[in-house]
């Protein structure tokens, strides 16, 4: 015999109190698959969390973080504070980037400046806590009689900070 509950679609639950009739999920609850015997309570985005997607009868609410914070953990289970550019968030709070490192975002960790000499280039613009160095032409290109060159783009694309 087929389980009568298997006919209950997403957004409903199989109500044992009503002869296994498929009943709609009550307000603030959902069922994302068919054949469920209960509906799950919708997630509430409160405090530092804000609603990115409202709960429906078939899917849970989705939260993100209010300005000044960013998501951490599966499904944005936690909010982590933003820091300023030129800083990184450690377990003990926002700390300035050490000399020779930079962070051009409000999240992530400080990364070392590009070593221009590894690509045989010179430093065109010095790095700061907020910006990577800009590599210029190689020293050989700057020797007398060399044709003028347009400084190339930075030696590498900025990496993506860990999320």
């Amino acid at each position: 015999l087929q389980d009568p509950c298997s006919n209950c679609p997403a957004g409903t639950f199989c109500d044992n109190n009503r002869n296994q009739i498929c009943s709609p999920c009550p307000p603030n609850s959902f069922s994302s698959a068919g054949g469920q015997r209960t509906c799950d309570i919708c997630r509430q985005c409160k405090g530092v969390f804000r609603t990115r997607k409202e709960c429906s009868s078939t899917s849970n609410a989705e939260c993100d973080c209010t300005p000044g914070f960013h998501c951490l953990g599966a499904g944005c289970s936690m909010c982590e504070q933003d820091c300023k550019q030129g800083q990184e968030l450690t377990k003990k709070g926002c700390k300035d980037c050490c000399f020779g490192t930079f962070n051009d975002q409000k999240r992530g960790i400080c990364r070392p400046w590009t070593n221009c000499s590894l690509d045989g280039k010179s430093v065109l613009v010095n790095g700061t806590k907020e910006r990577d160095v800009v590599c210029g032409p190689s020293p050989a290109d700057l020797s007398p009689g060399a044709s003028s060159v347009t400084p190339p783009a930075p030696a590498r694309e900025p990496g993506h900070s860990p999320q």
Epitope: L72, E88, L89, T90, K91, I109
Partner: nanobody
Framework: EVQLLESGGGLVQPGGSLRLSCAAS????????MSWGRQAPGKGLEWVSS????????YYADSVKGRFTISRDNSKNTLYLQMNSLRAEDTAVYYC?????????????????WGQGTTVTVSS
């Protein structure tokens, strides 16, 4: 699959105590440092405490030093947080986290797996 499951949260009066547990599975527990973090209502994540894989080194946030004690039982794959002299400002969801190595790092990015959290409410 790596899993962390916290328990032991609840409602407690100021000055009271609670012991949180975190049951770990899916990895060699003793090989990894572990941490506790918390998120208070309307606030961001705050690191609370960390412990090395062997249990020989422990670290605490200034806000909990002298009141909270982190420990682990590697034979039971379980992490603990003993919380004494609880204050209203300790109210939060507490999360345990696995670190990427046997020693604890300086960053949240050093933690690669988080539990779902257990709620601690300190109120009279």
């Amino acid at each position: 699959e790596v899993q962390l499951l916290e328990s032991g949260g609840g409602l407690v009066q100021p000055g009271g105590s609670l012991r949180l547990s975190c049951a770990a599975s899916g990895f060699t527990f003793s090989s990894y440092a572990m941490s506790w973090g918390r998120q208070a209502p309307g606030k961001g994540l705050e690191w609370v405490s960390s412990i090395s894989g062997s249990g020989g080194s422990t670290y605490y946030a200034d806000s909990v030093k002298g009141r909270f004690t982190i420990s682990r039982d590697n034979s039971k794959n379980t992490l603990y947080l003993q919380m004494n002299s609880l204050r209203a400002e300790d109210t939060a969801v507490y999360y345990c986290a696995k670190e990427k190595t046997g020693t604890t790092g300086d960053y949240y990015y050093d933690m690669d797996v988080w539990g779902q959290g257990t709620t601690v409410t300190v109120s009279s």
